[in-house]
Interface confidence: medium
């Protein structure tokens, strides 16, 4: 009998409010044994897949999708889904990325840290970011 796949979670580092031109990394998490994570935008209108899956904990795996320099076009809702043979999971909750003009003012925080959506509401753990250098720098054109 096939197992029921838990919904993935999605989070953004350093947060969901990103200054124009800064970087953001979406972190998708699911159970161990995931073959492929997919980051989707706006009801599957655009997406990107990766097999660069690392083990985040004994019971969780994760994939990271980085945008080096965000633009207004990167703003919007994102969600994760994963493929664990032989089937796809349900989608995570949406996470809304906001892109703001850099104000330069010391009083306004640049990001909202620890923003996440999904069954596990907690910040992502950077200590498990052991993926290959080749996966660094997901350019904006990959995502829209």
């Amino acid at each position: 009998q096939e197992e029921d796949l838990p919904r993935p979670s999605i989070s953004a580092e350093p947060g969901t409010v990103i200054p124009l031109g800064s970087h953001v990394t979406f972190v998708c998490r699911g159970p161990v044994g995931v073959q492929t994570f997919r980051l989707e935008r706006e009801s599957r209108s655009t997406y990107n897949d990766t097999e660069d899956v690392s083990q985040a904990s004994p019971s969780e795996s994760e994939a990271r999708f980085r945008i080096d320099s965000v633009s207004e076009g990167n703003a919007g809702p994102y969600r994760c889904i994963y493929y664990k043979p032989p089937k796809w999971s349900e989608q995570s909750d949406y996470l809304e990325l906001l892109v703001k003009e850099t104000s330069g003012g010391p009083d306004s925080p640049d990001t909202e840290p620890g923003s996440s959506a999904g069954p596990t509401q907690r910040p992502s753990d950077n200590s498990h970011n052991e993926h290959a250098p080749a996966s660094q720098g997901l350019k904006a054109e990959h995502l829209y």
Partner: antibody
Framework: SSSVEESGGRLVTPGTPLTLTCTVS????????MGWVRQAPGKGLEWIGT?????NTYYASWAKGRFTISKTSTTVDLKITSPITEDTATYFC????????????????WGPGTLVTISS | ELVMTQPPASVSAAVGGTVTINCQAS??????LAWYQQRPGQPPKLLIY???TLASGVPSRFKGSGSGTDYTLTITDLECADAATYYC????????????FGGGTEVEIK
Amino acid sequence: SSSVEESGGRLVTPGTPLTLTCTVSGFSLSSYVMGWVRQAPGKGLEWIGTISIRSNTYYASWAKGRFTISKTSTTVDLKITSPITEDTATYFCARGAGNVYYSDYYFSLWGPGTLVTISS
Amino acid sequence: ELVMTQPPASVSAAVGGTVTINCQASQNIYSNLAWYQQRPGQPPKLLIYKASTLASGVPSRFKGSGSGTDYTLTITDLECADAATYYCQTYYNMMDDGAAFGGGTEVEIK
């Protein structure tokens, strides 16, 4: 410079398993996905399958069960498990453009091909 | 199953002219499309990827366009060396026949 070259193509009788080998140089198979594509005489290109850097394999629906793709550190093999006459074709090995994202799974580097003839 | 349709099977044009080759996917492939040129007796050569990005060393006479399910390869200022068969290929979803090729379009130069 980077290159790929196929070998192992020959005349075999139907039902006789055949393994084709793709030997790569100038790049690492740990950094690129690889695929196999075939072309029957006078016909178009047919994607058979792709193997990722993590050795996950993806096959065309018609190729599942008939072909097996595997790899070592320097070679990528295509096994035709039980050839039929319709498998007569030139078989190309091709390197994907990238390694992680499926959006880089188009083929940027091709070998010259190896001819397989299945006949009794 | 993802199917790529590439009509017509052949097209003829004069040197210096323009030729347009179409490719249609059976579902939205979100610009995950490549174009290849294959001359007789040679392996295919990558021309365009991500629907409109020119591969390294490919002349700007080759232009890819399109989105969703419909894509086009346009070759302007045709040269004799452009006589070849052109194939579209998607790499949309590796779980579902994701690297399917179109049937090819042969370009004849008059």
